[in-house]
């Protein structure tokens, strides 16, 4: 092909090539042709004669102003036609008359200001029709019932001001899964406008400047339709009352999005006519108060997002948003509640009362006065089968004993990114019988004791990254009770002292993050009492990260019996000469990182076993000694391996001898090394 298109598996990509005409030298069996972002003005039907197998043609982002009806005659199998971002202004009855097999037609961002006659009447198989970002002033797409298989009609970002039954009833035999009318300034919903559509399941009217009165009118027009999903985000629904959604009483609405409405006042009973609702988003609003009847009637709600839903605190304390006790009492089937990013002062004794099905509760950056968690904080969750609790970013500084005693079914507890500074007695976790993960990373200061985790033997994941961890070297180890632990993160704590029994008994440990600590002394031969082998017995360890620990020695036998190790990261240390056979048990290793050390020599008796099944190797930025003794085996291995070694040409450079300084390792000529082998032997004799 003389064109610079790339062709693979019957797909031709000719995008971004400044083409002014359709290439005539592509394989005739292509089924997908991408001609986007070129300079095509026309699509002569004759040019497509040779590509009769096309099922998808994308000519978006060109300057096409007219379509030849014969185009689709040449492309009888075409299913997807994308004409977005062109200069089409008029469609006639003939434009798509031969495109009878189309399932998707994309016409967004053209200049189609009016649809005359019936240009889509032959598209009996069309599923998606996208006319968004045009200048359409009405929804009129034809004069007779058509498009019976249409599921998605996208009309966002047009100039539609009224929805009229006489325009929408061409869809009398259609089941629209999605009618997208967002970013139109709708001012009128004529009587029966939605009833005329065969079935309408989802209506999106985001950014349509709907006020409470228009919203109420809209809901009445949706009465007795099949509507299930209604999205009214980014409108002007400043307040809701019992009448706002009353028209939806005779629907089975399951999803409602009211985000970004500057909603201030949620009147009592606002949702009382929505008993089928399962998903409600009130994100990014300005709610001042929730009262015990705010959510009345939402007896089937499963998901509620109140992320940044409340008014932001101003100078006046009176502006603090308020969640009255029992505000959630009606939500007996609610499973997921998100209250992130708010300014709620704190919990009250009955804040969450009634949420008897709640499983996931996210309270990240929710509270302004929750510095101390007490055994009263979550009392209102006592009857909730909570599985996940997110308490990040709340400026929590202390956890009192029994704080979580109400949450016997909790599996995941996230306390990260707070300001906790305390000694962990272990009583903080009392009652967490089923806990699976505790995330405590990024807090101020945690002092461990032997009993810190004695009450949570079910724990499988414990994250203690960057918490200025103290007392890690106590005996018995604080982690001794955690027989089920599979992930332990102790990174970024500047730990310098640990005992050999730190991880004793953690036979199920699979991931150990120990990077950014200070273990150098512990692995020195000169260490009093000898090197500390804290990895012994971790027979199921898969991933080990010891990056940035100042290590300049690896003791013999430290990795012995760690047969299941798949990844070792020893990068950013000071390792130079590694003892032979230290990696002999790591034949299952898939990833090895030794970047930015002081390694000069890569020899078979050290690296032969771990290199056997390696997928990825990172030894960049080491000062390699480019002599036969030091690297000939490595260079030969590099040149025949399938292992991924990124930046091999640029970041694996010789440091010595002087005349090889800066020379790419992989270009080192090893042929003379082999020749000299017999002479070496003779010299030894």
């Amino acid at each position: 092909s003389t064109t610079k298109c790339t062709v693979s598996h019957e797909v031709a990509d000719c995008s971004h090539l400044k083409l002014t005409q359709v290439p005539d030298d592509l394989p005739t069996n292509i089924t997908v042709l991408n001609l986007t972002h070129n300079q095509l003005r026309r699509l002569p039907a004759a040019n497509f004669t040779r590509y009769s197998q096309l099922t998808s043609l994308d000519v978006g982002f060109n300057t096409i102003s007219k379509l030849e009806p014969e185009l689709c005659q040449k492309l009888p199998m075409l299913k997807v036609l994308n004409l977005q971002h062109n200069e089409l202004s008029q469609l006639s009855d003939k434009t798509f008359a031969f495109c009878t097999n189309l399932t998707e037609l994309h016409l967004m961002s053209n200049s189609i200001q009016k649809i005359k006659n019936n240009p889509f009447v032959k598209q009996k198989n069309l599923i998606t029709l996208d006319l968004s970002h045009n200048g359409l002033s009405s929804t009129k797409l034809g004069t007779q019932v058509q498009l019976e298989n249409l599921q998605e009609l996208l009309l966002s970002n047009n100039k539609i001001q009224a929805l009229k039954s006489e325009e929408l009833d061409i869809f009398a035999n259609s089941s629209l899964k999605k009618l997208e009318l967002s970013s139109n300034q709708i001012k009128e919903f004529s009587p029966g406008c939605f009833q005329t559509i065969g079935k309408l399941f989802a209506l999106l009217l985001n950014n349509a400047q709907l006020n409470p009165h228009l919203t109420e009118k809209l809901c009445w027009e949706l009465s007795n339709t099949s509507i299930q999903n209604l999205s009214l985000a980014n409108n002007q629904l400043l307040a809701t009352s019992e009448s706002t959604f009353s028209g939806l009483k005779w629907t089975n609405l399951t999803q409602l999005d009211l985000s970004y409405n500057n909603l201030h006042d949620v009147g009592n009973g606002s949702f009382s006519y929505l008993p089928s609702l399962r998903y409600l988003s009130l994100e990014y609003n300005n709610i001042q108060r929730l009262s015990p009847r705010s959510f009345y009637g939402l007896s089937n709600l499963r998901y509620l997002s109140l992320k940044r839903a409340f008014t932001k605190q101003s100078v006046s304390l009176a502006s603090h948003p308020n969640i009255d006790d029992f505000s959630f009492q009606w939500l007996k089937y609610l499973e997921y509640l998100n209250m992130d990013d708010n300014n709620i002062p704190s919990t009250k004794s009955n804040t969450f009362t009634g949420l008897v099905s709640l499983k996931y509760l996210s309270l990240s950056k929710t509270f302004t006065s929750l510095q101390t968690l007490t055994n009263e904080t979550f009392v209102s969750l006592a009857h909730s089968p909570l599985l996940t609790l997110n308490l990040t970013k709340n400026h929590i500084s202390k956890i009192a004993n029994g704080t979580f005693s109400w949450l016997g079914q909790l599996r995941i507890l996230d306390l990260g990114l707070n300001e906790i500074e305390q000694k962990l007695s272990g009583q903080e976790w009392r009652g967490l019988r089923n806990i699976f993960e505790i995330y405590l990373s990024y807090n101020k200061y945690l002092q461990l004791s032997t009993s810190s985790f004695a009450l949570v033997p079910s724990l499988q994941r414990l994250m203690l990254r960057r918490v200025a961890l103290k007392n890690v070297d106590i005996s018995p180890s604080p982690f001794r009770p955690l027989r089920n632990l599979t992930i332990l993160d102790l990174s970024n704590n500047n730990i310098a002292n640990i005992n050999e029994d730190l991880l004793e008994g953690l036979e199920n440990l699979e991931i150990l993050d120990f990077q950014h600590n200070n273990l150098a002394r512990l692995w020195k031969r000169a260490n009093p009492g000898g090197p500390v082998n804290f990895l012994k017995g971790l027979s199921h360890l898969h991933i080990l990260n010891l990056e940035s620990n100042g290590l300049d020695e690896i003791p013999v036998g430290v990795f012995k019996n760690l047969f299941e190790l798949k990844s070792i990261n020893l990068g950013l240390n000071n390792l130079n000469k590694l003892e032979p056979f230290i990696f002999d048990d790591q034949t299952s290793l898939r990833s090895l990182n030794l970047q930015k050390n002081l390694i000069t020599s890569v020899e078979k008796d050290v690296f032969g076993p771990p290199f056997q099944n390696l997928n990825s190797l990172d030894m960049r930025f080491n000062p390699f000694d480019c002599t036969c003794e030091s690297i000939s085996w490595f260079v030969n291995w590099i040149n025949q391996t399938h292992t991924n070694i990124s930046e091999l040409s640029t970041h694996y450079l010789c440091n010595t001898p002087h005349h090889y300084y800066g020379f790419p390792l992989k270009l080192f000529d090893t042929s003379s090394c082999k020749d000299s082998a017999p002479f070496e032997l003779l010299f030894i004799i």
């Epitope: 007779q144 019932v145 035999n173």
Partner: antibody, heavy 122, light 107 residues
Framework: QVQLQQSGPGLVKPSQTLSLTCAIS??????????WGWIRQSPGRGLEWLGI?????????NYAVSVKSRITINPDTSKNQFSLQLNSVTPEDTAVYYC????????????WGQGTLVTVSS | QSVLTQPPSVSVAPGQTARISCSGD??????VHWYQQKPGQAPVLVIY???ERPSGIPERFSGSNSGNTATLTISGTQAEDEADYYC??????????FGGGTKLTVL
């Protein structure tokens, strides 16, 4: 086989209302695959379209600009017929009037009534 | 399509090809239908959607349409083809626009 049978008076006085009916057999006036309309032909002149009705969720009509203020076309679903009313007739309205079935999607007339000569005279 | 223009008359010898034109601004973008009307009778559809022939219409009738002109072609014209011929199209809200008609005379 679709048949259209026209009926109505052949003589109408000026200023009165011309009324014609078109009875349908072999199809339904409420069909959503066809539309129904009236055409006339003045003596020695060409064909002139008068108006059309079609059913979607409700009935819609379109009338020729030349008669828009005087014409009404109505369906009668119970009798499976449709009618033409033309008010305030003048001798200029003397013509042969045809009812017709328009076939979707592009409105060709595949069936015509037999035609009725209506004379407007006092 | 507000105006369709036809020649008032066309003459053709029997067995020859008759061509009747129908011109209108950008008529090629619209579907054109052709009707035959014999004296004292209602019109009959002979070509629809530019070039389609209804059942029962002889094969000698064909149609084409592009640019600003649609054409009805009768090849091997017979005496019985003598009639008035009307082209027509639709353009919402005018659901029918007729040409002025062409009288075909078979010599």
């Amino acid at each position: 086989q679709v048949q259209l049978q026209q009926s109505g008076p052949g003589l109408v006085k000026p200023s009165q209302t011309l009324s014609l009916t078109c009875a349908i057999s072999g199809d339904s006036v409420s069909s959503n695959s066809a539309a129904w309309g009236w055409i006339r032909q003045s003596p020695g002149r060409g064909l002139e379209w008068l108006g059309i009705i079609q059913k979607r969720s409700k009935w819609y009509n379109n009338y020729a600009v030349s008669v828009k203020s005087r014409i009404t076309i109505n369906p009668d679903t119970s009798k499976n017929q449709f009618s033409l009313q033309l008010n305030s007739v003048t001798p200029e309205d003397t013509a042969v009037y045809y009812c017709a079935r328009y076939s979707y999607p592009f409105y060709s007339i595949d069936y015509w009534g037999q035609g009725t000569l209506v004379t407007v005279s006092s | 399509q507000s105006v369709l223009t036809q020649p008032p008359s066309v003459s053709v010898a029997p067995g020859q090809t008759a061509r009747i034109s129908c011109s209108g601004d950008n008529i090629g973008s619209y579907y054109v239908h052709w009707y035959q009307q014999k004296p004292g009778q209602a019109p009959v559809l002979v070509i629809y959607e530019d070039s389609e022939r209804p059942s029962g219409i002889p094969e000698r009738f064909s149609g084409s349409n592009s640019g600003n002109t649609a054409t009805l072609t009768i090849s091997g014209t017979q005496a019985e083809d003598e009639a008035d011929y009307y082209c027509s199209s639709y353009d919402d809200p005018n659901f029918q626009v007729f040409g002025g008609g062409t009288k075909l005379t078979v010599l």
